[in-house]
């Protein structure tokens, strides 16, 4: 690229006209402040391209950088561009105007920065001061760029004298920023709301001082924008929060809400999403099934659990035989309903050292103004079996009988067994099961009674032995779902004078 005049620094008269020419082997263009001003482009017969920029009626505001660059950098050295700096000394222009963002200088580390106060005349003496101080700071000045050095977090101004008047620049603010990788968290006051209620979401970024939040949400897609509010959590340093608040939600507001956070210093970004459901009205729904018959074991503790979903939070009541239950002062019953997630609940009834009287019909009812659900079951108290009596008798009929009586819940099964070789029984020889077969020459008669008050079954079984010719060990075993109990008796023949 060939620039005429070559510069690199030109000082031009105010109100004059000046022509800049740039030529190259490919199309060239003049740029000023990242824009292309009106210019005359041409191609010569020898294939050289040129662009002529005519600056007319120059003022101090034309002071600055001018670049000539290839219009199309394909296949060319992309970094080839020529820079000219033009001064137009203009007593009517003090310091060149800055964009608002140039007045705020952000630092993420201790590094040299430039306070870009520039004048139109390279002959002017410019000094740098703290905003509230008169002493000139010993910082080198470049008329094309400004003051460069390492600065503290303060406010600064530049001063110069044009003719007989002192001119001050705008104030420049230097800030040292806390910057780290971005970590976004999004949460909602509620992820489920009824229509007409408010949706409030919060997006929080930790470890950064300057970030940009951008929300996307269902309402935005239909062009209905909501203005988020950003604040700093004063009690937590470097916590910035953006709040998106949608009053009076509609069903169409259901969907994904995304918070995208960008940090321009290091160009980091992160985003998180959350789903919001807007329901027409509240609900209560049972999750999973609870059998209509539940069991508890006597004197053991038992927790009965119901899981359900609800919004808004419901009231939960437990009933036994249609009477309301509450936490008992004696600590025999404990009720608790806990929120395991925003809309999921676990309600528990705990019976401590279960008593027979606690058997019955239980109901859990969960309800609010929009819906209700209830779940009922029968609680059965299981009682381990015990043999209450085992006796042998010799009726006049000549047969011998053994009577076994026991109780338990659920209903016990009875098993009779006998062993004829007392020396080897029961370790070496298994006992023989007795029943209603003729081989055993025994008969069995069993009666079962349910005792309502005690809520358990009583089993009475009588074993009739036709003839006993030698001592016999007879065992009565009662079994149910929660245990078993055994007793045994030695039955001796009529002819023997003793029993054991």
């Amino acid at each position: 690229l060939v620039v005429t005049p070559p510069g690199p620094e030109l000082v031009l008269n105010v109100s004059s006209t000046f022509v800049l020419t740039c030529s190259g082997s490919a199309p060239v263009v003049w740029e000023r402040m990242s824009q292309e001003p009106p210019q005359e482009m041409a191609k010569a017969q020898d294939g050289t391209f040129s662009s002529v920029l005519t600056l007319t009626n120059l003022t101090g505001l034309d002071t600055g950088e001018y670049f000539c660059t290839h219009n199309d950098s394909r296949g060319l050295e992309t970094d080839e561009r020529k820079r000219l700096y033009i001064f137009v000394p203009d007593p009517t222009v003090g310091f060149l105007p800055n964009d608002a963002e140039e007045l705020f200088i952000f630092l993420t580390e201790i590094t040299e920065i430039t306070i870009p106060c520039r004048v139109t005349d390279p002959q002017l003496v410019v000094t740098l001061h703290e905003k509230k101080g008169d002493v000139a700071l010993p910082v080198p000045y470049d008329h094309q760029r400004g003051f460069s050095g390492i600065f503290e977090d303060r406010s600064y101004i530049c001063k110069t004298t044009i003719g007989d008047r002192e001119v001050d620049s705008d104030a420049y603010y230097v800030y040292r920023l806390q910057v780290s990788s971005i970590n976004v968290s999004v949460n909602a006051v509620q992820t489920v709301v009824r229509q007409g209620e408010n949706i409030t979401l919060m997006c929080i970024v930790i470890g950064n001082e300057v970030v940009n939040f951008e929300w996307t949400y269902p309402r935005k897609e239909s062009g209905r924008l909501v203005e988020p509010v950003t604040d700093f959590l004063l009690d937590m340093p470097y916590h910035i929060r953006s709040i998106l608040h949608i009053p009076s939600a509609e069903l169409e507001d259901s969907g994904t809400y995304t918070c995208n956070v960008t940090e321009s210093v290091n160009d980091h970004q992160d985003e998180k999403a959350i789903n919001i459901t807007v329901v027409e009205s509240g609900y209560v729904r049972l999750l999973g099934e609870v059998g209509t018959l539940q069991f508890a074991e006597l004197h053991r503790s038992r927790t009965l659990q119901v899981v359900f979903e609800a919004y808004p939070p419901p009231t939960v009541l437990w009933f036994k035989d249609n009477r309301t239950l509450g936490d008992s002062s004696a600590g025999e019953i404990a009720l608790s309903t806990r929120n395991v997630s925003e809309t999921r609940y676990v309600s528990e009834l705990t019976l401590v050292r279960v008593k027979v009287a606690e058997a019955g019909h239980y109901t859990m009812r969960a309800f609010h103004e929009d819906a209700e659900v209830q779940l009922s079951f029968q609680l059965q108290i299981n009682v381990p079996v015990r043999v209450l009596e085992l006796s042998e008798s010799h009726p006049d009929s000549g047969e011998q009988t053994v009577r076994c009586r026991g109780r338990g819940m659920p209903q016990p099964n009875i098993i009779w067994s006998a062993c004829r070789d007392l020396k080897r029984c029961p370790r070496e020889l298994p006992p023989t099961l007795l029943g209603n077969s003729s081989e055993e020459e025994s008969q069995l008669e069993t009666n079962v009674t349910y005792w309502e008050e005690e809520q358990e079954f009583e089993v009475v079984s009588t074993l009739r032995l036709q003839h006993v010719d030698r001592p016999l060990s007879v065992r009565c075993t009662l079994r149910n779902a929660v245990g078993q109990d055994t007793q045994e008796v030695i039955v001796v023949p009529h002819s023997l004078p003793f029993k054991v």
């Epitope: 620094e9 030109l10 008269n13 004059s16 006209t17």
Partner: nanobody, 120 residues
Framework: EVQLVESGGGLVQPGGSLRLSCAAP????????MGWYRQAPGKQRELVAL???????TYADSVKGRFTISGDNAKKMVYLQMNSLKPEDTAVYYC??????????????WGQGTQVTVSS
């Protein structure tokens, strides 16, 4: 003090022609552009034609096709050939040169002006 010397003005009838000349002193190192400006009574000064050191020319719309600017770099001369003159071309015509003596600082200087009057 740099002095530009103009010549060639005068009274001419509508449709007639005039050629203006302007000479810059030899002490000038480099000229960026030389041009002709005019100022009619009660009006602001306006550009008529401009020629750069590279020979690029610029004209005011009102004179395109009628006036021609040309230059001689070696002699540091600029000329304005004015044809098909109209009464509205009546004005004082000033020569202007933007030049440098050190390639960094550029100055623009004006001639004293030469009167052109187009009238029947």
């Amino acid at each position: 003090e740099v002095q530009l010397v103009e010549s060639g003005g005068g009274l001419v009838q509508p449709g007639g022609s005039l050629r203006l000349s302007c000479a810059a002193p030899g002490s000038i190192v480099s000229i960026n552009n030389m041009g002709w400006y005019r100022q009619a009574p009660g009006k602001q000064r306006e550009l008529v034609a401009l020629i750069t050191s590279g020979g690029t020319t610029t004209y005011a719309d009102s004179v395109k096709g009628r006036f021609t600017i040309s230059g001689d770099n070696a002699k540091k001369m600029v000329y304005l050939q004015m044809n098909s003159l109209k009464p509205e071309d009546t004005a004082v015509y000033y020569c202007n040169a933007v030049f440098t003596t050190d390639t960094r600082n550029w100055y623009d200087y004006w001639g004293q002006g030469t009167q052109v009057t187009v009238s029947s």
